[in-house]
Every structure is written in C-alpha cells, then in structure tokens.
C-alpha cells in the first residue's frame, strides 16, 4: 500500500516528487539557504525517509528551521551592536563591531558582519574571524615645543609608554602594543631565564607610588648578537606579558618607527628620554623624569668615545647617540632599557628611535653622549619575535 | 548571561529515588530555544547524557535509563528537576545540568556529587 | 545502541598541533560535538556542528567530520589546553559521548 502523500516543511522542498510513494520508495528534504534541518529541535546534516511495507514512513517529517549564528564573538577593547533588532542572531542579521574610541583602532575590516547560510557571523571581506582592537600608538599629553629642557618632571600622560622594570635591579622599558615590553638586553639579562621575577609597572608617575597597574612577564627575548660583559651591540631585548593591559590616558604604547623615521632623527634633531634614573643628586628620581637632547653626529660620537678609558670601537652602527657637547643633560643608571623617543610630524606620533643603552662613567659628562640602541635597526628583529610569540 | 546552578542530596541510599533539581538564572527557562538537559559523569569516567525537557514538558530520555528516569520542568520557578528511581552504586556520578540549544549543551552548570551509598 | 571511540590519551608539545579523533559508524552523516574538561571544573562547548566555534573559544581550536572520523584540532597548542576531551553526537534522538581523550601538553 502506498505511504501517505508527503508535504514538504514551510522553507523546504522535497525530492523526488512522484505521484505517490509505495513500497522502499524514498524521498529527501532540502532546505532554502539560511534554513536548517532539524529534528525536533536537533540539527540534521541530511534527511531521507522511506516508505514501510507497512505503508508508513520509517521516520517523520523534518522540519526547516531559520539559521541561527549564536551570538557573536565578544570584541576586546571593543564591543558589539545588533543592527537588525536585539539580540537577534538569525540568518541575514547584522551586527556591528567597534572599537573603544581614542585608544584602539579597528583593524582587518569595517566591523559589518552578517549571519550566513552556513551558521557563521561573516563580514563583507568573507572573514569569520571578530575584527581587531589594537591599540593606537604613540599618543601624549605633551606637545614638543623643539627645546631643550633639562630634567623637567614628567606629568600624567606625558609619557604613557614608560615601564618600570623592578627585577635585580631599577630599569625601564617601553610598551609595544598591549602585551609587549621593548627594553635594553644590558637591563635584564640577569632575569632571561626566570622572567617571572621581573617586577613590571605601568601608568606609574611616581617611583614609589602605590597607583601602577601591575604586569608580569610570560618570556624573554635577548638579541641573539648581543653578548653580556663585551660591548653593547645589540642592546635590545624584547618581554611578553603574561596579559594584555588596557589601554588609556595614562598607558599607551609607543609606535615602532617606520620606513620614514630616519628623516625625523637626523643630527640636532630633538629626541625625549624618560626614567627615574639617577639624577644631579645621584638618587633615584622620585618623580619621573624626562629630558630633551639633542641626536649626536654618528662620527662626532665615535670618536667621543676613542679615547682612554673607552676602547675603540664601542660605538658601532647599531648605536645612536644624543646628548649636548657640555653635558648636563642625559640619562643615567636606573633609565637603561627606557626609550628614546621623537615625534614623526607626518603622523603627529611619538615613535621609539633609541634605548637607553650606556654612556659615560659620570653621566651628563661634557664632551660625551648618551648612546642608545638604533631600534630602526631590529624592526625585522622585533616583528619577527612579535608575529611568532 | 545564563547560569545553572544544581541542588539536591548529596547522598542517596540504595533502592531510593535520586531528586535534584536545576535553577536557571539570567534568562527565562520558557524560551522557545531551547532545550534543558541533564548529564552524569561517574568518579574518573566519561560523560552520559540523562535526557531533555522543553519548557511545555516535552520530553527525551537515554533509552538504557529511560525506565527510572523522569525529567519535569516548572517555568514559575525557572527551574527542571530530575528524579531516578531504584539506584544503585552504579549511580553515584557527579550530576550536571545544561542548557541544550539545537542539540549542543552550553553552558553547564557546576555539578553536584550524588553518592548511593547506605 | 550507537557508540562513539577515542583514544584514552594523547600527548603533544607547546606550539604543535594536537588532533583528537572519534569515530562512529557514518559518523560523517551527523553532526559531532567537541567538550573540553579541565580538572574540577564543568564541561565547556568548544565545538559544534562539526566545525563550528562558540562565541569565546580561541581560533586554534577548529573541527572536521567526514566518514566515520570527527576530529578535533588544536593549533598552536598551549599549557592551557591540557584536558579531557569528549566528543558527542546525536543518534536517533539520542545523545551519546565518547569515552573522553586525556591530552597532556608536555615540558
């Protein structure tokens, strides 16, 4: 006896249509794009019933239920709008992911997503994946005014990138995006096996103060060209954090230099250092500190630092150096691994031109300079530790 | 953000009937999405699931348990309950409840440990 | 009754990819669900349908099922992702689970 005649769900068709259905005649059910099968409430990859001896189908009718994409990816530093009604995640909906203004930038596409047929959140671009926040760069409270300023305390997102590195010993560092700190080889090599030991502070002013937001290290990464105790070529060191830090007024990271930063770090060009190094006084700053010098002449420098007790050759390419011919204004023990930092006036962007590396036996000696790591030099270096840690 | 929380007798004697019962919070167990479902794990062993029940009282049970097991549902208080019969030592597990949207169980509750013992 | 197999264990270093099968018969004709369970802790969705990822769940955990072979893969493997794994299907209106896969992340 023939099975009875099958109707087809709302949102689907069935196949093979025949004028009736008998004995292990079969049909399938397919839905419209942006519906599924579904069982009671249980997804199906496929359905196919058969017709019984008994003259009944060997299961019931499926039914075809709208595509639901779930809610979306949560967005850090970020958030998520529902465009077409709240809460509402079904097929053809639409979503929109921004960033949290002033501090974070949108990155891979323009936020839009809409639920596909195939059950996935997907943007214009055919990307699954949740945009990205990252953080913008090199902004600060100060404006430079081209001057040079000796000493001058440091005011509340003056310098936003400044990390304080308690460890063995006071040293600082500079943010790189939301999990990175860029800092000298020199300043925490003795913590390159136990990164867990550095003691790293953020959004900090004061030394001492107890208003810092806390972050430990997860690795450490020394250049493998520098060597502890011979010279300070490739005084550059990178840390990963163990969690990203949010970002605000008081803690940004600083940008990376591009292609075209050479042309803001030329002789006499203004460059900022920053720490609580030892001061006139000989202590720790209190207060951090920061001071305006200008770049030394690469061979002016060198041969600085030809005579006794230096030996030849400690200047290499891979240093640059700033400070005045009378001295007076430089950065000392406690701002090594700090930044060197200047202003690409294209971008309006502070950007990293130099690490506090080493310099003369008594700092702000006339006649010598303040030499710092030539970061232009590692971008290779950092981006390659970066994209694969 | 939806949140299962069990509750019930953490120990149960042999031949009696095991009762707990799940609260929902965070979100209405009436919505026409989805499911509620109950799961066990027996110390150092894998997951089973029990069954799940839909807010108008519709039903499915694992059929190895189906005779001792019924699942009930009350939507004034936002909460389903579980009751299997006639246990054995066989049943002491670790008991979870779950939210069962088109047949994939998030979020779980915490877990509650029924031990059959005398 | 329908059921599904797992290798008791597996093991894999950090940064490697670790790949968690269950097989069923025609596992390939019905959707595969991924479990993870840490220590002490509740079950967590880590895949659904097959390949689909929960909002949350980071982009190295992904899913296949074709055959009557599910796996689950882990790129880029961390500390973090040392659990039990179970995988679930729906048969017949039934649910069913493997019997769970240890995977340790080594060092």
């Known amino acids: 006896q023939p099975c009875p005649y099958p109707m087809a769900p709302p949102n689907g068709h069935l196949s093979p249509v025949q004028a009736k259905y008998i004995l292990k005649d079969s049909f399938s059910i397919f839905c419209e794009p942006g519906y599924e099968l579904l069982q009671g409430h249980l997804p199906l990859k496929s359905f196919a019933a058969v017709c019984q001896k008994d003259g009944s189908w060997d299961q019931p009718m499926p039914s075809c239920s709208i595509v639901d994409c779930g809610p979306p990816d949560d967005l850090p530093s970020g958030r998520v709008e529902y465009i077409t009604g709240p809460e509402v995640t079904t097929y053809k909906a639409v979503i929109q992911y921004s960033c949290e203004e002033t501090f974070y930038t949108m990155k891979v596409n323009d936020g839009k997503y809409v639920c596909e047929a195939d059950g996935f959140w997907t943007s214009s671009k055919g990307e699954r994946s949740p945009p990205v926040c990252e953080p913008v760069c090199g902004l600060s409270a100060r404006t430079t005014g081209g001057q040079i300023y000796g000493g001058q305390k440091a005011k509340p997102g003056d310098f936003p990138w400044q990390v304080l590195i308690l460890g063995g010993s006071t040293a600082a560092g500079a943010l790189l995006y939301d999990n990175w700190v860029l800092t000298a080889a020199h300043a925490i090599y003795e913590q390159k096996h136990d990164a867990s030991s550095l003691d790293i502070r953020l959004g900090a002013l004061k030394r001492l103060s107890p208003h810092y937001t806390q972050a430990w290290a997860e690795a450490v990464f020394i250049h493998e060209g520098y060597t502890h105790d011979a010279g300070f070529d490739n005084d550059i060191a990178l840390i990963k954090l163990n969690n990203k830090v949010v970002i605000n007024s008081n803690i940004t990271p600083i940008c990376l230099p591009r292609k075209e930063a050479e042309s803001f770090m030329r002789t006499d060009d203004i460059g900022t250092a920053s720490g609580w190094g030892l001061t006139q006084r000989g202590l720790l700053a209190r207060n951090l500190m920061y001071v305006d010098i200008p770049i030394v002449d690469h061979q002016k420098c060198t041969a600085a630092y030809e005579k006794p007790p230096y030996s030849g050759g400690s200047v290499t390419a891979n240093m640059l150096c700033a400070g005045l011919e009378s001295g007076g204004k430089d950065a000392c023990r406690g701002d090594s691994g700090g930044a060197l930092v200047f202003l690409d006036n294209e971008t309006q962007r502070w950007f990293v031109g130099g690490i506090v590396s080493w310099g003369s036996m008594n700092c702000g000696e006339a006649g010598q300079y303040g030499v710092y790591t030539k970061v232009i030099n590692y971008i290779p270096w950092i981006k390659n530790i970066i994209s694969n840690f | 953000q939806v949140q299962l929380q069990e509750s019930g007798p953490g120990l149960v004697k042999p031949s009696e009937t095991l009762s707990l019962t799940c609260t929902v919070s965070?979100?209405?167990?009436?919505?026409?999405?989805?499911?509620w479902g109950w799961i066990r794990q027996p110390p150092g062993k894998g997951l089973e699931w029990i069954g799940s029940?839909?807010?108008?009282?519709?039903?499915y049970y694992n059929p190895s348990l189906k005779s001792r097991v019924t699942i009930s549902v009350d939507t004034s208080k936002n909460q389903f309950s579980l009751k299997l019969s006639s246990v054995t030592a066989a049943d002491t597990a670790v008991y979870y409840c779950?939210?069962?949207?088109?047949?994939?169980?998030?979020?779980w509750g915490q877990g509650t440990m029924v031990t059959v013992s005398s | 009754s329908y059921e599904l197999m797992q290798p008791p264990s597996m093991s894999v270093s950090p940064g490697q990819t670790a790949s968690i099968t269950c097989s069923g018969d025609k596992l390939g004709d019905i959707y595969a669900y991924w479990y993870q369970q840490k220590p002490g802790q509740s079950p967590v969705l880590v895949i659904y349908?097959?390949?689909k990822r929960p909002s949350g769940i980071p982009e190295r955990f992904s899913g296949s099922n074709s055959g009557n072979t599910a796996t689950l893969t882990i790129s880029g493997t961390q500390a973090m992702d040392e659990a039990d794994y179970y995988c679930q299907a729906w048969e017949s209106s039934t649910g069913v689970f493997g019997g769970g896969t240890k995977l340790t992340v080594l060092g």
């Open positions: 965070g979100g209405s167990i009436s919505s026409s999405s989805y499911y």
């Open positions: 349908q097959d390949n």
């Open positions: 029940i839909y807010y108008s009282g519709s039903t």
């Open positions: 779950a939210r069962d949207r088109r047949g994939r169980f998030d979020p």
